[in-house]
């Protein structure tokens, strides 16, 4: 049963297809696993700054340092990836800036191309110089943490030398890694000192250790694999938007709703209204009216502009966004003041970030 009574139809989608729509995208900061990352909150005049990751409050810890408007992440891991926000709290309002952090090792995904140089890794030694195993190309082993999208190919390399030529074996989570441990098995290219797993799945997550040994010694190196899943997701709305606003009778006001969505979003601006002097229908559900929606005749649907407002415009405004996966909505309140109670200036617009198309 719908949770409201409709004055105008609000369905999952409009009857006419929406226009092609440019969705706001947060800035993306990319770091390789193990690296440190520093981000400055791009908001002005902040009295107090609070940070969130994926909507959850972020506090300082042994790897996360929060100093003023800076966020530092030391020794980034794939788990640090996500949607971050800094919120600047001021005496009269607050403002939020969003950014993405992507901690990923692009090299680990499908990099068979560099196998052409693998022959260099196969070092032949003078038979008289007996030598324990040693790494011949530590550069190719620096990235220990590999975050890879599901279904991609992963290659781990441990280029080594020694005399006699060492052998290589692989462990998963400290135990012998057998072909039957994963669907499709894996490939070991001894010539290139590599382990290759195709079409990785979440169960492939874990620690992979190469053990390189000969009769004179043994060395090992461990990689951590994180398999990142990709699934369709419903729209994400920027926290704190739309923001509450106030203006005087006759003033103008603007509400902003920032949307993140892979799939085409349909944006609706909805207001609680009265019908026959009542805010609720016979079923006890509130009356709602669609003020604007993304469609053929709609301009920038992420912004709702109200001009020459009257006291009747006061109330709650809902930004409702749907795609084929699901919905999200957030709301804000408009306070309309009589002219004699003007809040310092004739027109007051919400203190929200500039709209970026």
């Amino acid at each position: 049963r719908p949770s409201f009574s409709l004055v105008e139809d609000t369905t999952l989608e409009p009857e006419e297809p929406p226009t092609k729509y440019q969705i706001s995208q947060p800035e993306v900061y990319v770091a390789a696993p193990g690296e440190s990352l520093e981000v400055r909150c791009l908001l002005k005049d902040a009295a107090v700054i609070s940070w969130t990751k994926d909507g959850v409050h972020l506090g300082p810890n042994n790897r996360t340092v929060l100093i003023g408007e800076y966020l530092q992440i030391k020794g980034a891991t794939p788990r640090d990836s996500g949607l971050y926000a800094c919120t600047a709290s001021r005496t009269v309002d607050s403002e939020t800036w969003y950014f993405m952090v992507n901690v990923t090792d692009a090299i680990s995904s499908g990099d068979d191309e560099d196998d052409t140089d693998g022959a260099e890794d196969f070092v032949s030694e003078n038979s008289n110089n007996k030598r324990a195993p040693y790494w011949t190309n530590t550069e190719k082993m620096e990235k220990r943490l590999h975050a890879v999208p599901a279904a991609n190919t992963v290659k781990f390399r441990c280029p080594a030398g020694g005399n006699p030529m060492p052998t290589m074996r692989w462990l998963k989570n400290g135990k012998e890694f057998k072909q039957e441990h994963r669907i499709g098995g894996y490939k070991v290219r001894n010539q290139h000192w590599s382990l290759i797993m195709e079409s990785v799945v979440p169960s492939d997550k874990g620690n992979y250790t190469c053990v390189v040994e000969n009769e004179y010694g043994s060395i090992n190196h461990t990689y951590h694999l994180d398999v990142v899943e990709r699934s369709p997701h419903r729209p994400i709305l920027q926290a704190g938007l739309p923001a509450n606003a106030s203006t005087v009778v006759g003033g103008d006001v603007e509400f902003v709703c920032k949307v993140y969505s892979d799939a085409q979003p349909h944006i609706q601006w909805i207001k609680h209204v009265e019908k026959n002097g009542s805010k609720y229908g016979p079923d006890g559900l509130p009356y709602l009216k669609v003020l604007k929606h993304s469609g053929i005749n709609s301009s920038n649907a992420e912004v709702l502009a109200l001009f020459n407002v009257t006291e009747a415009d006061a109330g709650e405004y809902i930004c409702k966004v749907s795609n084929y996966i699901g919905q999200a909505n957030q709301s804000a309140w408009l306070t309309v003041l009589p002219k004699q109670q003007a809040p310092g200036r004739e027109k007051e617009i919400t203190a929200s970030p500039d709209y970026l198309e």
Epitope: P2, E13, R234, D262, A263, Q264, Y324, I325, Q327
Partner: antibody, heavy 114, light 107 residues
Framework: QVQLVQSGAEVKKPGSSVKVSCKAS????????MHWVRQAPGQGLEWIGA????????SYNQKFKGRATITADKSTSTAYMELSSLRSEDTAVYYC???????WGQGTTVTVSS | DIQMTQSPSSLSASVGDRVTITCKAS??????VAWYQQKPGKAPKLLIF???YRYTGVPSRFSGSGSGTDFTFTISSLQPEDIATYYC?????????FGQGTKLEIK
Amino acid sequence: QVQLVQSGAEVKKPGSSVKVSCKASGYTFTSYNMHWVRQAPGQGLEWIGAIFPENGDTSYNQKFKGRATITADKSTSTAYMELSSLRSEDTAVYYCARGGFDYWGQGTTVTVSS
Amino acid sequence: DIQMTQSPSSLSASVGDRVTITCKASQDVSTNVAWYQQKPGKAPKLLIFSASYRYTGVPSRFSGSGSGTDFTFTISSLQPEDIATYYCQQHYSSPYTFGQGTKLEIK
């Protein structure tokens, strides 16, 4: 794990109605649309409509508007699709699918025959 | 409604072949296209969404590309288990329409 379990096969007379259920588990039922898709024997896929269980919002293919009714019961995490005024060409397998069409029910065969 | 025209309607290929299926939308749908695999008597399985995102657990031999009105689905090296019917679908606007399907057979 995510599962969508549909009700069993139905045989119906022309002019009657059928109500197919789809019980969801393994995820938050109210957070995703539930779509209904049908497939006539030897034919392609046809989208019927969808519901967002959190607030009951529905969307229908105009072809089925007035004949199809999609509902959801949040308390049992079950979605329903009722099709009325059945005719022989409604004979098909009816599927429910979660929001991103990433999980599908096993299908319910509805046969309309006099 | 947005029409999705899929071609070919059927095709025969050998194991190891590169297979390509195309889908044309009757209007601009940006990158809002998904591809599904359906085997007889089974529900469809999502392979690709948003034109090029491979769904979780889908083998890397499956890929998708395109935007606007023209979309391509590719199997880089056909495997015996890939024998099925493949459908494209636009998820840009309701009603979410499907292509008529491509039946893939082994030579």
